[in-house]
Interface confidence: low
């Protein structure tokens, strides 16, 4: 057992980030943070529960944003975020920190929450070690924080799996290690040999690396082969002098929290005590009081560890803990080729020319279903359809390449150039304008000290 502690140092715009508050013109608000811990370094499914635990910070001080003021570091809640863990500290874990903004204006139905930033870090961390600092960017925001894991007595060690007992305690009990010579006290964990496995090794003296059952090698990285068990299914332990089973599916009892293991073909099954669940009974009896629902999800049931909780997720989120943002645009709400934009608080459709409405559902002309290629625009006239083609294209459906300068748009000897954003005319001396159609009056005087960047006399008049 132990506690994961997170200290937020600052949250604000990062270097090169939003120079002004992106929430200007809103009323007073305050920040709070959510932390979610998941075991392992693997890319877990986003909706997997916060199996190691979750915590919610207190609300920070009320902050009224100034529309024209630069966004400062925002005022933070006081104190640590603490996530207790009942079982072994896994050493490798995923840390998810969410920064939430609570608007305190006159909201219908109470305060409005919005997620400002989410950072996810996969880390190795030994329990009992010093604070680890980190700086993470999320969009234009920057979050500075420190974290550590510490064991709570009587647990000790880098995984909080060693239990401090009087020296008389058995040396062969499962998972037990003798304490320091001083009666009923635990010594500070020694520094193990560099590279010693956090999961499978431990040390009682600085510089050593001693292996847990089932593992061997100088750094405890090598699983013990079952073929070496020679009928006993295991060699004598080099760490205790006791005979221990070799690595079968239930060896070392993979079931946490007092779960009992039974072997199945090629695997195992845990029967968990009340209040625990999961493949290895690693998920403790989370209740709604633990705040397991992210992103404003509503927790129901789960009043005690024996009853399961259910998270009812707000629009835009899903998963057992509402951790996963729904791709709302995958529902394709925009018709007629409109582009779907998820603005966070709402969806918006950016409509193609000729269409309008919240879902681009209104046809503005009789060109619906008419496809003009290469950026051409369908235009109506007398009930007939036709395409008005973009520069460089022609034909009935704008599928044929055309020389945009073939029409000789530049007057008075100007030279035509096709530019990605249109035609430009390089005018002969004495002429100006989009098509060099205007003679330059001799009274013309420069109003600015320099030509546009890269533009010289005789260069195109229309600089992109």
């Amino acid at each position: 057992a132990g506690v994961f502690e997170l200290q937020i140092h600052s949250f604000g715009p990062g270097p090169g980030g939003a120079p002004r508050s992106p929430y200007s013109a809103r009323g007073p608000c305050r920040l709070f943070f959510r932390v979610c811990l998941k075991p392992g370094l693997s890319e877990e499914a986003a909706e997997s529960p916060c199996a190691l635990g979750a915590a919610l910070s207190a609300r920070g001080p009320v902050y009224t944003e100034q529309p024209e003021a630069p966004a400062p570091d925002l005022p933070l809640p006081n104190g640590l975020l603490q996530v207790p863990f009942r079982d072994a500290w896994p050493g490798t874990f995923s840390l998810i920190i969410e920064t939430w903004r609570e608007e305190l204006g006159d909201q219908i139905g109470g305060p409005a929450w919005s997620l400002l930033a989410r950072v996810t870090r996969r880390r190795r961390l030994a329990a009992g070690g010093p604070w680890a600092g980190d700086i993470q960017r999320a969009g234009a925001w920057e979050l500075r924080f420190s974290y550590r894991a510490r064991c709570e007595l009587p647990a000790v060690g880098t995984a909080c799996t060693r239990l401090c007992r009087p020296r008389s305690a058995s040396r062969c009990g499962p998972g037990l290690r003798p304490c320091a010579p001083l009666e009923d006290e635990c010594e500070a964990p020694p520094v193990c040999r560099a590279g010693c496995s956090l999961e499978h090794g431990f040390c009682e003296q600085p510089g050593e690396c001693r292996c847990l059952e089932g593992w061997t090698g100088p750094l405890c990285m090598v699983p013990v082969s079952t073929s070496s068990c020679l009928g006993l299914r295991g060699p004598s332990s080099t760490t205790t002098g006791c005979l221990v089973p070799g690595p079968g599916p239930c060896d070392g009892n993979p079931c946490a929290n007092g779960g009992s293991c039974s072997e199945t073909p090629g695997s195992f099954e845990c029967t968990c005590p009340r209040g625990f669940y999961g493949l290895r009974c690693e998920v403790s009896g989370v209740t709604c009081a633990d705040g397991p629902c992210f992103n404003g999800g509503l927790c129901v049931g789960g009043a005690d560890p024996d009853s399961a909780y259910i998270c009812h997720c707000p629009p835009g989120f899903q998963g057992s803990n509402c951790e996963k943002r729904v791709d709302r645009c995958s529902l394709q709400p925009c018709r007629n080729g409109g582009l779907c934009l998820d603005l966070g608080h709402a969806l918006r459709c950016r409509c193609r020319a000729g269409f309008a409405g919240p879902r681009c559902e209104h046809d503005l002309n009789d060109c619906a279903g008419r496809a003009c290629a290469n950026g051409g625009t369908c235009v109506e006239g007398g009930g007939a359809h036709r395409c008005s083609c973009a520069l460089g294209f022609g034909g009935r459906d704008c599928r044929e390449r055309a020389d945009p300068c073939a029409a000789r748009p530049c007057a008075h000897g100007g030279r035509c150039y096709a530019h990605f954003s249109g035609l430009v005319c390089a005018c002969a001396p004495g002429y100006m304008g989009a098509r060099c159609e205007f003679p330059v009056h001799p009274d013309g005087v420069s109003a600015l000290p320099a030509a546009p960047p890269g533009l010289r006399p005789g260069d195109p008049q229309r600089y992109p």
Partner: antibody, heavy 120, light 107 residues
Framework: EVQLVQSGAEVKKPGASVKVSCKAS????????MHWVRQAPGQSLEWMGL????????SYAQKFQGRVTLTVDTSISTAYMELSRLRSDDTAVYYC?????????????WGQGTLVTVSS | DIQMTQSPSSLSASVGDRVTITCKAS??????IAWYQQKPGKSPKALIY???YRYSGVPSRFSGSGSGTDFTLTISSLQPEDVATYFC?????????FGQGTKVEIK
Amino acid sequence: EVQLVQSGAEVKKPGASVKVSCKASGFTFTDYYMHWVRQAPGQSLEWMGLVYPYSGDISYAQKFQGRVTLTVDTSISTAYMELSRLRSDDTAVYYCARQGNYVNNAIDYWGQGTLVTVSS
Amino acid sequence: DIQMTQSPSSLSASVGDRVTITCKASQNVGNIIAWYQQKPGKSPKALIYLASYRYSGVPSRFSGSGSGTDFTLTISSLQPEDVATYFCQQYSDSPYTFGQGTKVEIK
């Protein structure tokens, strides 16, 4: 929001000069040509000339050569049109208008107009 | 200078009618023409550029067509707020020139 705000109405005597201002906002002034167009009472629109604020280049319609002067002050995003040696047939509403600087662009925004009355 | 000749000079139609205004250039201007709407006492408002492209915010009942020397502005279903004078303008060559205008009224 694109806005072109012109100075107020003027009453002038024949032979005098008038200077009308046009303050631009809501867009980058130096990226657009600024045109001046006038409209006599009950008549059509008549193009007078243009100025390109970026470079100060100007072009006048032949009819107004020698009588009209177009200037800009880029520091305050303002264009000016001065018409001298006024005659009674110069009585009109004078408009400033902007035009983007690509081949396809037409005049797209107009000021509200300034009525200049020339009367003895 | 390029002359722009509009017809008719005025017309009266009923709400919902299809209205067509034509503009003829004295020489080929490609599709470099624009159409403007001017309501009484107001400044002109741009409707169409490059002969057939509507500006943002212009109702879809307004459409333009034509190229070379002959151009048309069509109001597919006349509305009371369309009462105005409509001008064509070529911006192909200097000096820019306008048609003399077509005054549209409701019957």
